[in-house]
Interface confidence: low
């Protein structure tokens, strides 16, 4: 499990770096953050470390009430502060690993998913 979570953490951070450059990666991370009410890998401050993301900005999908541009010059009280790796990882543990529905090899597909899909260039609106 620790290995799975470590890989998921590394992959999530890697995809964060791709967020400003790849629209399809952005769309998947946006949906994850919106669905799981989380922001960043460990927490929302992780977005500060992304070179091509401007300071004082997180994706709009981090906002508690998502509106266009809500992540720019955000107020801490208006965004989800909890990190996605722990939150999604906890969900995976509860719903997947503990039910023994999938193996660690299957979870490896989650790492593969976005990186394989990134080979295709998708635009979004």
């Amino acid at each position: 499990r620790d290995k799975v979570m470590s890989e998921f953490n590394n992959n999530f951070r890697q995809q964060m770096e791709n967020y400003p450059k790849n629209n399809h990666t952005a769309s998947i991370l946006d949906r994850m953050q919106a669905d799981f009410k989380c922001c960043g890998a460990a927490n929302y401050t992780d977005w500060e470390k992304i070179p091509s993301m401007s300071k004082n900005r997180v994706p709009d999908s981090c906002c508690i009430n998502v509106t266009v541009g809500c992540g720019i010059n955000f107020n801490e009280k208006a965004i989800h502060k909890e990190g996605c790796v722990e939150k999604i990882g906890g969900w995976l543990r509860k719903n997947v690993l503990e039910q023994k529905l999938i193996s660690e090899e299957d979870l490896g597909g989650e790492q593969k998913l976005i990186s394989e899909e990134d080979l295709h260039h998708h635009h979004h609106h």
Epitope: V66, T67, V96, D106, H124
Partner: antibody, heavy 119, light 108 residues
Framework: QVQLVESGGGLVKPGGSLRLSCAVS????????MNWIRQAPGKGLEWVSY????????YYADSVKGRFTISRDNAKNSLYLQMNGLRADDTAVYYC????????????WGQGTLVTVSS | DIQMTQSPSSLSASVGDRVTITCRAS??????LNWYQQKPGKAPRLLIY???NLQSGVPSRFSGGGSGTDFTLTISSLQPADFATYYC??????????FGQGTRLEIN
């Protein structure tokens, strides 16, 4: 009970436009992402577009990008699909669909509205 | 995009039979797989979510299984109301979600 009722379908010529509407009731609309999913006659299901609960996040299938626009009016509990540049292969029943969370399936569907694109 | 392939495309069976429909994903989707039933002229109905969880109100004769790339929908004892078309759908890569081509279950 949860209800989703589509309207606005009909016959339109290729290149024409149509606006579909979906009136929802029976749940807190602002809690849910919403989708349009279509089904060509005698064919399978194809996801078209989704919109986040606030309306800020929107995504489209490649087949409709640049031609279709999804929107919602949370005050009116309504979902819309503006369809421009319609083509024959857009002919389908269009369903308005509630999306509780991306990993839990589409739990409520409208009855559908038929869009026919033909000259 | 992730491709979903169902088999068989159509299936004939009798009331009381045990029936299994399979769905294969082009890459691992963990357990993010849903099953729907659709009757002619009606909207699809969610049966199973998360590969194996029964949606509220769905009879217990329906069950789902599998993980990774291979999944099954099983009807333990077919009832007249079960003759319909069944679709699988992945929600792992979202957007876009993708559906299988459908399996038509007919009366033998």
């Amino acid at each position: 009970q949860v209800q989703l009722v589509e309207s606005g379908g009909g016959l339109v010529k290729p290149g024409g436009s149509l606006r579909l509407s979906c009136a929802v009731s029976g749940f807190t609309y602002t809690d849910y992402f919403m989708n349009w999913i279509r089904q060509a006659p005698g064919k399978g299901l194809e996801w078209v577009s989704y919109i986040s609960n606030s309306g800020a996040i929107k995504y489209y299938a490649d087949s409709v990008k640049g031609r279709f626009t999804i929107s919602r009016d949370n005050a009116k509990n309504s979902l819309y699909l503006q369809m421009n540049g319609l083509r024959a292969d857009d002919t389908a029943v269009y369903y308005c669909v509630r999306d509780p969370r991306s990993y839990y399936g589409f739990d409520y569907w409208g009855q559908g509205t038929l869009v026919t694109v033909s000259s | 995009d992730i491709q979903m392939t169902q088999s068989p495309s159509s299936l004939s069976a009798s009331v009381g039979d045990r029936v299994t429909i399979t769905c294969r994903a082009s890459q691992s989707i963990s357990n993010f797989l849903n099953w729907y039933q659709q009757k002619p002229g009606k909207a699809p109905r969610l049966l199973i979510y998360g590969a194996s969880n029964l949606q509220s109100g769905v009879p217990s004769r329906f069950s789902g299984g599998g993980s990774g790339t291979d999944f099954t929908l099983t009807i333990s004892s077919l009832q007249p109301a079960d003759f319909a078309t069944y679709y699988c759908q992945q929600s792992f890569s979202n957007p876009p979600v993708t559906f299988g081509q459908g399996t038509r279950l007919e009366i033998n």
